[in-house]
């Protein structure tokens, strides 16, 4: 038994162009949290397969509000470790998925909204009890930096947490053949129940008398390293078991570079040159492939058949982001024309069109005048999805069917009298006024406000302008 511990160091924009926009805004403050899922072995399991080794959820991070115009910084993180307890032996090799989630704290109906910001996955070798392993993973434009380790819970010890420790029976030393339990020097190893000679570092047992090997080791007692390539090191004595040279003391012996990386010695240590798709101190950090199921919400994974080639998610309409994890408000793109109302139904987009328009995007302007006649010599005018008639003089109404009373609106000003006429109306003006609608006063001195009186009329005559 033991605990896998994950420490998130930073989550923010990765290097290079195309920095992501901040996931939070002044209008929509948010906070981050993380989820880790662990599976045993290096098998290519579906993303949905259960987290057989366990899973954990972090606390919520501090609330963050974007500074307008500022690039997305490293985002504030939750405190503490993510801890995944495991009950049985630590498998030595494992697969992980780490998801970064955003909790939006705006005025959400029904509580906060959650959305996935990024998801990284990988496969690693790790011995329990070892130091923290550092890692960097990228998901689209985001970069996640983290460390992890597996530690045994007392009384278990060893690289697989299968050896047991017991308090000392004598104060000074352990019993015959039993060693102190590092780092618990005041305790002693419990008597081994594994097969005699089973490697305490590379073997473990769950039944008395057996010796099961951690990945990378073989032989009846798990003392023989599995040779991934023919003898890598020129140093050291030959091993009769494998016919290969056992690694000597040089920093590159045994090739610490994983995933086909090549090792070169440096004055102080070693350096790995990693193949495409891998990076990290020992080339242990791998790219996510399509087999990891990185595309959400129905996204299709294109390319990325192996870690050497980057994958791309083609997102269904309505989703975006490097993993199709962000929902787009498709109505914000204003797809409905001519004032149509947009409805995003999730599986489909619908436009409710105004009268006079049709089509999936209300793009068709119906011929409003088609089949519509205006009576009494009126002409049909299209406009705004509705037809109207421009009526001949003396007629009115929607279809020009009503005989109009031209005097109904009292068009003659200043007390002028209105007379209906076959060609319209005539105003008989009160003394002192003139004009077609009796709108102009006649000045007392006989001058008119008009530039000139119409020919044949003296100022002051009753006006019969038509």
């Amino acid at each position: 038994a033991g605990v896998f511990e994950l420490q998130i160091h930073s989550f923010g924009p990765g290097p290079g162009p195309g920095a992501p926009r901040s996931p939070c805004s002044a209008r929509l403050p948010c906070r981050l949290f993380f989820r880790v899922c662990l599976k045993p072995g290096l098998s290519e399991e579906a993303a949905e397969s259960p987290c057989a080794l366990g899973a954990a959820l972090s606390a919520r991070g501090p609330v963050y509000t974007e500074q307008p115009g500022a690039p997305a910084p490293d985002l504030p993180l939750p405190d503490g470790l993510l801890q995944v307890p495991f009950r049985d032996a630590w498998p030595g090799t494992f697969s992980f998925i780490i998801e970064t989630w955003r909790e939006e704290l705006g005025d959400q109906i029904g509580g906060p909204a959650w959305s996935l910001l990024a998801r990284v996955a990988g496969r690693r070798r790790l011995a329990a009890g070892g130091p923290w392993a550092r890692d960097i993973q990228r998901a689209g434009a985001w970069e996640l930096r983290f460390s992890y380790r597996a530690r045994c819970e007392p009384p278990a010890v060893g690289t697989a947490c299968t050896r047991l420790c017991r308090p000392r029976s004598a104060p000074s030393r352990c019993g015959p053949g039993l060693r102190p339990c590092a780092p618990l020097e005041d305790e002693c190893e419990a008597p081994l129940v594994c097969r005699a000679g089973c490697s305490p570092e590379h073997g473990f047992c769950e039944q008395p008398g057996e010796c099961r090997c951690l990945e990378g080791w073989t032989g009846p007692l798990c003392t023989v390293p599995v040779s991934t390539s023919s003898c890598l090191s020129p140093r050291g004595p030959s091993s009769a078991t494998t016919g290969c040279l056992v690694p000597g003391p040089g920093p590159c012996d045994g090739n610490p570079c994983a995933n086909g990386g090549s090792c070169s010695e440096t004055p102080r240590s070693f350096e790995c040159t990693c193949p495409r798709g891998f990076y990290g101190l020992r080339c242990e950090v791998s790219g996510v492939t399509c087999a990891d199921g990185p595309c959400f919400n129905g996204g299709l994974c294109v390319g990325g058949a192996d870690p050497d080639s980057a994958y791309i998610c083609h997102c269904p309409p309505g989703f975006q982001g490097s993993n199709c994890e962000k929902r787009v408000d498709r109505c914000s793109l204003q797809p409905c024309r001519n004032g149509g109302l947009c409805l995003d139904l999730g599986h489909a987009l619908r436009c409710r069109c105004r009268a006079g328009f049709a089509g999936p995007r209300c793009e068709h302007d119906l011929d409003d005048c088609a089949g519509r006649a205006c009576a009494n010599g009126g002409t049909c005018v299209e406009g705004g999805g509705a037809h109207r008639c421009s009526c001949a003089l003396g007629f009115g109404g929607r279809d020009c069917r009503e005989r109009a009373d031209p005097c109904a609106a009292r068009p003659c000003a200043h007390g002028g009298r209105c007379y209906a006429h076959f060609s319209g109306l005539v105003c008989a003006c009160a003394p002192g006024y003139m004009g077609a609608r009796c709108e102009f006063p006649v000045h007392p001195d006989g001058a008119s406000a008009l530039p000139a009186a119409p020919p044949g009329l003296r100022p002051g005559d009753p006006q019969r302008y038509l």
């Epitope: 579906a46 949905e48 399509c290 199921g293 129905g298 299709l300 083609h314 309409p317 797809p335 999936p360």
Partner: antibody
Framework: QVQLHESGPGLVKPSETLSLTCTVS????????WSWIRQPPGKGLEWIGY???????NFNPSLKSRVTISVDTSKNQFSLRLSSVTTADTAVYYC????????????WGQGTLVTVSS | QIVLTQSPGTLSLSPGERATLSCRAS???????LAWYQQKPGQAPRLLFY???NRATDIPDRFSGSGSGTDFTLIISRLEPEDFAVYYC?????????FGGGTKVEIK
């Protein structure tokens, strides 16, 4: 209701280019991905490729070197061109839209048989 | 690419019987992105299920879809005369999009 209709010559000579057009009604071409699928007589379905109005395309690797798919948003149409055809390209060619829930095929055209023969 | 193998190739049953169709993938179909189609002679295929188990519009509930990983199943609980057709599965998790070879459900 989305409706699709394939059109184009039913007979193409070997080594020539097969050209088909799919006319879409009941949906805007900019709302979906649009795809071509074919089915040789008496055989199963084979995906050819798809296009999005933005220009994103993806093709079946087995046909990629010979396929062009284009879209005409003004006519609400998309087209397929398959070059250097052989008799093995004889098939019923379907156009279809890809669903909003993922890259499966929601609505299909009725299909058009293209025979490659001299 | 993901190869989908459908079995059996032909299923001979009588109306009212239960039909069980299998679709097996050469590698895990990520996120259960698998669809089923029905095709009748002279017609285009018709979508039955997506996401392995989500029924498409207007599909009767005698049809059910299930499965994850590499194994998927389409069940027709009681065959109706109009159900005799060819059924195809299709994965849409990893490009290229691929179809199974089909299962023909014929009248016994």
């Amino acid at each position: 209701q989305v409706q699709l209709h394939e059109s184009g010559p039913g007979l193409v000579k070997p080594s020539e280019t097969l050209s088909l057009t799919c006319t879409v009604s009941g949906a805007s071409i900019s709302s979906y991905y649009w795809s071509w699928i074919r089915q040789p007589p008496g055989k199963g379905l084979e995906w050819i490729g798809y296009i999005y109005y933005s220009g994103t395309t993806n093709f079946n690797p087995s046909l990629k070197s010979r396929v062009t798919i284009s879209v005409d948003t003004s006519k609400n149409q998309f087209s397929l061109r398959l070059s250097s055809v052989t008799t093995a390209d004889t098939a019923v060619y379907y156009c279809a839209n890809l669903a909003l829930t993922g890259f499966h095929f929601d609505y299909w055209g009725q299909g058009t048989l293209v025979t490659v023969s001299s | 690419q993901i190869v989908l193998t459908q079995s059996p190739g032909t299923l001979s049953l009588s109306p009212g019987e239960r039909a069980t169709l299998s679709c097996r993938a050469s590698q895990s179909v990520t996120r259960g992105y698998l669809a089923w189609y029905q095709q009748k002679p002279g017609q285009a295929p018709r979508l039955l299920f997506y996401g392995a188990s989500n029924r498409a519009t207007d599909i009767p509930d005698r049809f059910s879809g299930s499965g994850s990983g590499t194994d998927f199943t389409l069940i027709i609980s009681r065959l109706e005369p109009e159900d005799f057709a060819v059924y195809y599965c299709q994965q849409y998790g990893i490009s290229p999009l691929t179809f199974g070879g089909g299962t023909k459900v014929e009248i016994k």
